[in-house]
């Protein structure tokens, strides 16, 4: 049984080894076989690993760039999945969210099609407050620490990429 | 209809300063991104920087950076190009142009431009 | 910045003819099956007027005569039966990422 599960990991394993060489994999409980795993140098947080991808592009670049690496720009579920993340990003800097509001009519839409709830929304204050800007950074204002913030979706940013462990 | 219609242009000697302004009507100009677009005589056409609807994020082409400033006032309908340290190869035809985004907000274009207004930079 | 490189610069058609005007991007401006590619038209002294979005869409008003065609980083602007009042100069633009950026234009006469 371990043997057959352990192929089927290996196979697994082989379909991300094109765009991630080199894995972490770290004990997750008792067993032998539990243990989940990230790309080298994504981090890991409960069951999803990251990765800051530094270059500056457009939304839609940003998504494409999260995607061919096996994940999408960055769902964020919790405030904890928040706290995690921003100890890895730079004050000076903003961050693609996998969030945007296609129709301009503030009905915001996560890439990955998880529900939009306004309870677990991290924006800055008196945001979002442009109709034509319709995709969503994380960013830093002295005032208030990390939050969102609406911006034109063409304007280049860096981005922050989310993908389920590989376990 | 809508109508933009530019003015402030003019002869201006090298390191100069001339204030662009675009009256627009007939839409709701609080609602849409503007741009200001400039063209040199028997040139192509050069993006030069353009606002957010509610005036809070602008942005500029690297040529123009520290030198322009473009701003909006809702209240009276208007655009505003503040152009310092004018050089001899800011001289263009200058439009102004409104954004109408399109797949879901991903993109736009450029679907109303102003006729221009030209602004020579000699001594 | 995306550059954008039209061809050719010059173009005499006869009138009732075709033209076909070339756009190519240095990068893809594509995302999810879209383009964010424009296409505009200028007559002498006027400012230029939108043709066609999304590399395909006509803007209304726009005659039928106008087409746009292509995906990725390979553009096509069409007049399917030249008429005298189609005598101008076309760009291209992308606006998938800024700055956004114009190709340099396409001169089109009758010959």
């Known amino acids: 049984f371990m043997y057959s599960k352990t192929v089927k990991r290996l196979s697994k394993l082989r379909e991300y080894q094109q765009y991630h060489p080199s894995l972490t994999c770290v004990m997750e409980g008792k067993d032998i076989e539990d243990w989940s795993c990230c790309p080298t140098p994504w981090t890991s947080f409960q069951s999803s690993c990251y990765f800051i991808s530094t270059g500056m592009q457009s939304w839609t670049k940003s998504q494409k760039n999260c995607s061919v690496m096996g994940a999408d720009l960055v769902v964020i579920n919790t405030r904890e999945e928040q706290d995690f993340i921003i100890q890895n990003l730079k004050r000076n800097s903003s961050y693609f969210l996998g969030l945007s509001d296609p129709g301009g009519r503030r009905h915001w839409q996560w890439v990955d099609q998880t529900p939009y709830n306004e309870n677990v929304t991290f924006w800055h204050s008196g945001e979002p407050n442009n109709l034509d800007e319709r995709c969503a950074i994380i960013n830093f204002r002295s005032s208030e620490e990390w939050g969102w913030n609406d911006i034109h979706c063409h304007v280049p940013q860096k981005s922050i990429c989310k993908m389920k462990k590989i376990y | 209809q809508v109508q933009l219609v530019e003015s402030g242009g003019g002869l201006v000697k090298p390191g100069g300063s001339l204030r662009l302004s675009c009256a627009a009507s007939?839409?709701?100009?609080?609602?849409?991104?503007m741009s200001w677009v400039r063209q040199a005589p028997g040139k192509g056409l050069e993006w030069v920087s353009y606002i957010s609807s509610g005036g809070g994020n602008t942005y500029y082409a690297d040529s123009v950076k520290g030198r322009f400033t473009i701003s909006r006032d809702n209240a009276k309908n208007s655009l505003y190009l503040q152009m310092n340290s004018l050089r001899a190869e800011d001289t263009a035809v200058y439009y102004c142009?409104?954004?109408?985004?399109?797949?879901?907000?991903?993109?736009?274009?450029?679907?109303?431009w102003g006729q221009g207004t030209l602004v020579t930079v000699s001594s | 910045d995306i550059v954008m490189t039209q061809s050719p610069d010059s173009l005499a058609v006869s009138l009732g003819e075709r033209a076909t005007i070339n756009c190519k991007s240095s990068?893809?401006?594509?995302?999810?099956?879209?383009?964010?590619m424009n296409w505009y038209q200028q007559k002498p002294g006027q400012p230029p007027k939108l043709l066609i979005y999304a590399a395909s869409t006509l803007e209304s008003g726009v005659p039928s005569r106008f087409s746009g065609s292509g995906s990725g980083t390979d553009f096509t602007l069409t007049i399917s039966s030249l008429q005298a009042e189609d005598v101008a100069t076309y760009y291209c633009?992308?606006?998938?990422?800024?700055?956004?950026?114009f190709g340099g234009g396409t001169k089109v006469e009758i010959k």
């Open positions: 990068q893809s401006v594509d995302y999810d099956g879209d383009s964010s």
């Open positions: 007939g839409f709701t100009f609080s609602s849409y991104t």
């Open positions: 633009q992308q606006t998938n990422e800024d700055p956004p950026t």
């Open positions: 142009a409104r954004h109408d985004y399109y797949d879901g907000g991903l993109y736009y274009a450029m679907d109303y």
